[in-house]
């Protein structure tokens, strides 16, 4: 059991109060993290509380303001970016969100040498993406789906691409599906390390079917939003990668990088680009049937002015038991010889581990091993490799940072974080300065988050960057729920769960149980992190027990568990939630007449299927923005796990795994269905079809739509949503208001 530190020292129970829904909706108990914006080995920038941009030098201990809040405010800047030569800063304002990562903004360039904004040849607006070159102060930006280059901020721009068209051709930025399901970025352009070359992707969406939905707004007629969105089995974007010499871009023009023959023979995806040197680049490609990935290392041939990708530098990664990679195919981290690299992929035992590839994947040297998984490679230096894993004490929901000395033989491994603040901190990420001279550790829990600065050679803590003192004080008189992370062993499957228990939990009493589920492939819900959220409130104030269970299909516990759901989504994820509920009932403190389940997105799909499982376990449940049929969801995501919805592939399971097919089974449960009408991700269509099937089956249910809201149901909708769901659950559990 993890006792939150705020409760340990307070014996005066009568001064304590439970969490309220208002606390949660107001974000009263939110925490802060500190990620340095590194600009060298020993310097970083940080935006102070009063909005000055301050440069800190760790070695001298000095700090000074490089950009005042007055300058920031003069253009209403909400973000900034310093040029590597430190002569200019871009200021970002008029932020306008598009999809998950993408947004447009207005950019102003401020000249630090004369303390004035650059006048003449100003940037157009709104810009879709803008970035400095890694050296000097060249600018690349995307405007109206075309890429432009400025040699200096005050120079006129050079237009690199001319074919960009809204919803048709995207240059330097991803289309919807690449942004959400493949790149997970707002950009699709990459500078070479010294800024000599600029690589970019072109996405051609001309033949992609379009999803159209109404945006009601305030006008007399609603607008129609049109997004090229390939659903499972539909025509996909066509991607090409180009590289242009930024010194004399008008000469050779952009050069297309060839696609490996074994990839180009059928539909394929580009998955990532990694620059190795100014004249060597690594591209990763993936077959549409996502069990084969090819990593291709390409070299610039000065004499030919072209990029050569020899077959000898193609490395194939193939999965025979599932899809390639975890959620995404991992990216390589190159070593100093600029040809060998480190990469995470499955070992022979089916656990994701770090491998060192010098010539071929077949001859890869395994760097980590064990019945746990390496999760991220943070940095490779001449003598050290820093990575995170969930090895420590065999808790898959933890993250610790490790250092492997690669300069010595045999390599030695050290856990940097395992014993730093053992009770408070079990889930870390890290941010490294150049050459890993220094690094910041950000601990997310299970105690109150804390960010610290460390020496990259000795690992010594230099200072605390953020310890959330105000939060700690605010929580002193709050009755927080207790949390425990344990596991169930069922039929050779390990089901890790997190249970959130009311503050005065008594094992001899009976409590209503709420299952919170996500359950998507390669996800993890049972994590040792701090959170004061809606379910904390439900436990603290309403006396519910909340449980989260990681079943088959979830991540970081080996391929057997992960790939169990391959080609059959909606089966084992649901079974495992049900199995866990039965085990919880056996524990003796659950009121089996008051069990509910809720989930959002993939979790909405799983909760719907669990409610319609016919087990009689659940009295009620909520699905927020659920997928209802895999034929309605994005090709890149869906086909990764389900194959194609064709007769000769997996159409049968596509049809069998819909929520609509189980409409009759909702008759004996209370079901609340919720969706935003402007959901670009899981389209409102999904809930519309569930509702239609329930009506056709004459099954009563409750529903709520949120007009013009997307998949996140943000702003005032959030308050309404959680208030509405609270009422629904309290009614279901016969709890008085």
């Amino acid at each position: 059991i993890v006792l939150r530190p705020s409760r340990v020292h307070n014996s005066e129970e009568n001064t304590m109060r439970a969490l309220t829904l208002k606390d949660i909706l107001n974000g009263t108990f939110s925490y802060k993290t500190f990620f340095p914006n590194w600009i060298s080995g020993q310097e970083y920038l940080h935006q102070s509380a009063d909005n000055n941009i301050v440069l800190y030098n760790i070695e001298t201990g000095q700090s000074y303001t490089i950009l005042s809040n007055r300058t920031m405010k003069s253009v209403n800047a909400s973000n900034y970016g310093l040029s590597p030569d430190r002569q200019f800063v871009y200021l970002e304002s008029d932020y306008s969100k598009l999809w998950r990562y993408s947004y447009t903004a207005t950019y102003y360039i401020y000249d630090l040498s004369n303390g004035e904004f650059v006048r003449g040849n100003e940037l157009p607006r709104p810009i879709q993406y803008l970035c400095w070159s890694p050296v000097g102060s060249k600018l690349a930006y995307v405007y109206q789906n075309n890429i432009y280059l400025k040699q200096r901020p005050g120079d006129p721009p050079f237009q690199i691409t001319f074919n960009g068209r809204e919803n048709k051709i995207f240059n330097g930025i991803p289309d919807w599906v690449y942004e959400e399901e493949m790149l997970a970025t707002k950009y699709a352009l990459w500078w070479s390390p010294n800024g000599k070359f600029l690589a970019y992707a072109e996405f051609n969406d001309t033949d992609i079917p379009v999803i159209a939905y109404s945006y009601y707004g305030d006008e007399q007629y609603p607008r129609t939003i049109n997004i090229p969105y390939p659903k499972a089995g539909a025509k996909n974007p066509v991607v090409r990668i180009f590289i242009i010499d930024t010194t004399y871009p008008a000469y050779v023009g952009p050069q297309e990088v060839p696609v490996p023959a074994m990839i180009a023979s059928s539909d394929y995806y580009f998955s990532w680009l990694t620059w190795v040197t100014d004249e060597r680049v690594c591209l990763q490609w993936l077959k549409r049937v996502q069990n084969v990935s090819v990593l291709s290392i390409c070299d610039f041939r000065e004499d030919w002015q072209t990029w050569d990708c020899p077959k000898t530098q193609e490395h194939i990664e193939e999965s025979r038991t599932g899809w390639a990679g975890g959620f995404f195919v991992s990216t390589p981290v190159f070593s100093y010889d600029a040809i060998s690299y480190y990469k995470i992929f499955s070992d022979k035992d089916g656990y994701k581990h770090i491998h060192y590839i010098k010539d071929t994947v077949e001859n890869a040297i395994q760097i980590t091993s064990g019945k746990w998984e390496a999760i991220n490679i943070f940095r490779v230096t001449q003598d050290s490799l820093f990575y995170s894993s969930n090895e420590f004490e065999e808790y898959p929901g933890r993250r610790n940072i490790y250092r492997i000395s690669i300069g010595s033989y045999p390599p030695s491994k050290k856990c940097v974080t395992c014993h730093l603040r053992k009770e408070r901190c079990q889930y870390y990420t890290a941010s490294f300065s150049d050459y890993a001279k220094y690094y910041a550790l950000v601990c997310y829990g299970p105690g109150i988050p804390i960010s610290t600065l460390h020496d990259g050679r000795t690992d010594q803590e230099i200072k605390i960057l953020e310890e959330n003192k105000e939060l700690e004080n605010a929580l002193k008189n709050i009755q927080l729920p207790k949390e425990e992370i344990k596991k169930l062993e069922v039929d050779e499957i390990t089901l890790w769960y997190k249970m959130i228990l009311p503050p005065q939990f008594d094992r001899s009493k009976k409590y209503p149980l709420l299952i919170q589920v996500y359950g998507g492939p390669c996800s993890q819900s049972v994590r040792s992190v701090f959170a004061v959220n809606w379910i904390s409130y439900l436990a603290s104030k309403e006396g519910m027990v909340i449980a989260l269970v990681d079943g088959r299909g979830t991540a970081f516990q080996g391929d057997k568990l992960l790939y169990a759901v391959y080609r059959k989504l909606g089966v084992y994820e649901v079974e495992d939630q049900i199995t866990a509920v039965r085990k919880f009932i056996e524990m003796g403190f659950i009121d089996e007449k008051r069990i509910a389940i809720w989930g959002w997105s993939y979790g909405g799909y799983v909760s719907s299927l669990a409610l319609a499982s016919g087990t009689g376990l659940f009295k009620c449940g909520i699905a927020v923005a659920p997928v209802s049929s895999w034929e309605y969801y994005a090709s890149v995501y869906t086909e990764r796990f389900m194959g194609l919805p064709t007769k000769d592939d997996n159409l049968e399971h596509y049809k069998n795994s819909t929520v609509m097919a189980r409409a009759e089974y909702f008759r004996n449960v209370d079901y609340l269905l919720i969706h935003g009408t402007a959901d670009d991700n899981v389209h409102f269509q999904n809930s519309a079809q569930i509702a239609k099937a329930l009506v056709n089956a004459q099954v009563d249910f409750q529903a709520m739509w949120y007009s013009d809201q997307n998949h996140g149901l943000s702003g005032l909708s959030t308050n309404h949503l959680y208030t509405h769901m609270t009422h629904f659950l309290k009614q279901c559990f016969s709890l008085s208001d």
């Epitope: 003449g120 040849n121 400025k150 040699q151 200096r152 120079d155 006129p156 050079f158 237009q159 001319f162 074919n163 090409r240 180009f242 010194t247 004399y248 871009p249 008008a250 000469y251 050779v252 023009g253 952009p254 050069q255 297309e256 004499d303 030919w304 002015q305 072209t306």
Partner: antibody, heavy 116, light 108 residues
Framework: QVQLLESGGGLVQPGGSLRLSCAAS????????MSWVRQAPGKGLEWVSA???????YYADSVKGRFTISRDNSKNTLYLQMNSLRAEDTAVYYC??????????WGQGTLVTVSS | EIVLTQSPGTLSLSPGERATLSCRAS???????LAWYQQKPGQAPRLLII???TRATGIPDRFSGSGSGTDFTLTISRLEPEDFAVYYC?????????FGQGTKVEIK
Amino acid sequence: QVQLLESGGGLVQPGGSLRLSCAASGFTFSSHAMSWVRQAPGKGLEWVSAIWASGEQYYADSVKGRFTISRDNSKNTLYLQMNSLRAEDTAVYYCAKGWLGNFDYWGQGTLVTVSS
Amino acid sequence: EIVLTQSPGTLSLSPGERATLSCRASQSVSRSYLAWYQQKPGQAPRLLIIGASTRATGIPDRFSGSGSGTDFTLTISRLEPEDFAVYYCQQGQVIPPTFGQGTKVEIK
């Protein structure tokens, strides 16, 4: 050494068509952007069209819709298909290595005369 | 489009003299996109300068380029007999790329 050799010029009536060719050698033709630049008798230079190594085409407004640039990388040859020719298209047509500038190699040129 | 205006139209000089040719753009041109060419009668143009100031391969060092923004200059420090020709500046900043009308350097 790099060589560019134009051919296909000649006398043509207004409204007529002509196809110019440019045979390239001495460099990796398939990886270079190529352009056509013309020079009317006694006048200056005028860029006409360009094509990327990957095939994207660019045109001057004066020829857009009438001229088509293309390339055959297997034959190391650049083409300019000229339709609906006008008297003002009369010029020496040069093929040049480059996209929008730094034209480092030029052919000797081929004369196109549009006259009735 | 960007209009490039060269001056003077004709420059009459003797071998050994210094030639200064001017090129003015109707709008700002980044140095990276400004080139100079030499053309002799009956011949194709020859690339002299790229990026406003960098000599192309094989160009003698008596040719130099300078300038930025809208004003660029080509200088021939000591005219050789083979330098008498027409010189064109050219911008590749925007499509269409354009050439100046040319400056003729003739023997005085």
